[in-house]
Amino acid sequence: LIQERRSHEVNPAAHLTGANSSLTGSGGPLLWETQLGLAFLRGLSYHDGALVVTKAGYYYIYSKVQLGGVGCPLGLASTITHGLYKRTPRYPEELELLVSQQSPCGRATSSSRVWWDSSFLGGVVHLEAGEEVVVRVLDERLVRLRDGTRSYFGAFMV
Amino acid sequence: LIQERRSHEVNPAAHLTGANSSLTGSGGPLLWETQLGLAFLRGLSYHDGALVVTKAGYYYIYSKVQLGGVGCPLGLASTITHGLYKRTPRYPEELELLVSQQSPCGRATSSSRVWWDSSFLGGVVHLEAGEEVVVRVLDERLVRLRDGTRSYFGAFMV
Amino acid sequence: LIQERRSHEVNPAAHLTGANSSLTGSGGPLLWETQLGLAFLRGLSYHDGALVVTKAGYYYIYSKVQLGGVGCPLGLASTITHGLYKRTPRYPEELELLVSQQSPCGRATSSSRVWWDSSFLGGVVHLEAGEEVVVRVLDERLVRLRDGTRSYFGAFMV
């Protein structure tokens, strides 16, 4: 069977949710809740912010981040970059998979104006067993966490 | 078969579209077209705005709403919340699944400026047979319906 | 087997990426990279910007486009429309499937302000063998291509 995963085994899927510990401020990828509430892992693993592939194949990967602020933090670039990146033993650098750039601060016409914005990414990529996918947001100071429903990260085999 | 749904039966899927009757103005969830045009139900049911699950499993659920206006309606909060919510007999309240907050009015720098924005949500959640998923938008006055292509709601089992 | 595609054959999927040649300026649909980098076709074909269906069924189709600019180009309408459209021998006109309208220029409060925005669309539609799906952006002058990660187009059977 070319697609034998369909008949005898669980189709890999995961949905990870934002938590208080998601933002490390260290320049690393976002960290995620894997078990509580809506979060789950099924046929995928997790390690230090990364979804780790157990079974090679094509995966629809997705992430949403909730952005928000009051005006724009001093020194904040006008661009926020939200991306999904692949780490593979085959290459020394992280590889960009899906990326968005937004300028949400520009919505606030005064420095005291509260604003909210959301960035969603989703697409199909091929992943080998052992490869990892992470989410990065630059500048992560504008990511607004609450209860795991507004910022999240997931995947499923297609 | 762990994933027996894959071999002998249709994979549950649905895509519901926005219609003139979608916005009730009464605080309820959005209502949807289920049969005409692009709308369909396959292995899922519909009841008063809700997708109702027939077969338990993990579902990728999604919704998009088209927002628009001229300036900001008087008294409108600066935030629009677009969310997917679960109703289950196992819990007394609706449960937030996927939520976005946006401040689209802030894009219009004058009160007469026409603006458009779109909010997309999608993610994998576990649903039991008989549970419901609904879409809510607060404030729904800014949802712009047209022909079912700009605001919609769907799901499929993964 | 009602869903026989699941057990014995590859599940159709594709992910096409933005390239320098994507924007033709001719009013036609966006063109896409189909082989290099992250792009691939599996059980779907490609022709002049269009994903061509080989096997009838329900497909989750998606597209993201990266928008950006400095202020607003003179004469640019305040609305950008990003849509997925179907071409079918059964009907002389393209059919709108999923569409978003955005006013990203409104974010820039001065004519020299750099701004970025992103538009994501995704939903399930039924497609017959031989039917085509294309992506259109009006006005495409604001689409910002780079490396195939910011603007893309894909589909998979559900």
């Epitope: - | 309820g28 209502l31 008063d48 338990a56 007394p92 309240e93 008989g130 549970e131 | -």
Partner: antibody
Framework: EVQLVESGGGLVQPGGSLRLSCAAS????????MNWVRQAPGKGLEWVSY????????YYADSVKGRFTISRDNAKNSLDLQMNSLRDEDTAVYYC??????????WGQGALVTVSS | EIVLTQSPGTLSLSPGERATLSCRAS???????LTWYQQKPGQAPRLLIY???SRATGIPDRFSGSGSGTDFTLTISRLEPEDFAVYYC?????????FGQGTKLEIK
């Protein structure tokens, strides 16, 4: 804790009217669909009427159509059933019940309505 | 209108035995809209099973629901003394809800 408390039951003559109320607490009433279900003495359950969370959709059983009117006030967390042209066969315990899809997950304790001359 | 017929009308069993209650619909019912309730004398009904097979909160796992189309079953794997009551199936379709006439489960 979810509570549904019916009131307004009593004895009424055939052809008369009665208004039942149901006070809801312990959940966000405005977000849920509600129903009235009745049970005649020694008999089974019979669904009477349904109202969606926004009052946009209302259904009635054929046996009460044109005589009963369901309504709700989300600001007051209350559900009502106005019963007119009452008949002997309307004698029953009337329950208010919350619904999710087809499941009535929370029920009140019931209010007895007796129609008799 | 969809008519639900429950059988048997009365079921006499002893604690520890297995109970199988049937609910047959006059036309096909979506399994998402098939529900089972338990009712004891002087009490309101209690939700047991929704969506044909999902157990409600606090319902012991000895209760299970199955079936599709027109034939649905409530099974109590090992009867406890507190399980003796009247059981109703119920469905939603065509803008109305209907109940079966009930099955009385009594101690043998």
């Amino acid at each position: 804790e979810v509570q549904l408390v019916e009131s307004g039951g009593g004895l009424v003559q055939p052809g008369g009217s009665l208004r039942l109320s149901c006070a809801a607490s312990g959940f966000t009433f405005s977000r849920f669909n509600m129903n009235w279900v009745r049970q005649a003495p020694g008999k089974g359950l019979e669904w009477v009427s349904y109202i969606s969370s926004s009052s946009y959709t209302i259904y009635y059983a054929d046996s009460v159509k044109g005589r009963f009117t369901i309504s709700r006030d989300n600001a007051k967390n209350s559900l009502d059933l106005q019963m007119n042209s009452l008949r002997d066969e309307d004698t029953a315990v009337y329950y208010c019940a919350r619904s999710i899809a087809a499941a009535f997950d929370y029920w009140g304790q019931g209010a007895l309505v007796t129609v008799s001359s | 209108e969809i008519v639900l017929t429950q059988s048997p009308g009365t079921l006499s069993l002893s604690p520890g035995e297995r109970a199988t209650l049937s609910c047959r619909a006059s036309q096909s019912v979506s399994s998402s809209y098939l529900t089972w309730y338990q009712q004891k004398p002087g009490q309101a009904p209690r939700l047991l099973i929704y969506g044909a097979s999902s157990r409600a909160t606090g319902i012991p796992d000895r209760f299970s629901g199955s079936g599709s189309g027109t034939d649905f079953t409530l099974t109590i794997s090992r009867l406890e003394p507190e399980d003796f009551a009247v059981y109703y199936c119920q469905q939603y379709g065509s803008s109305m809800y209907t109940f079966g006439q009930g099955t009385k489960l009594e101690i043998k």
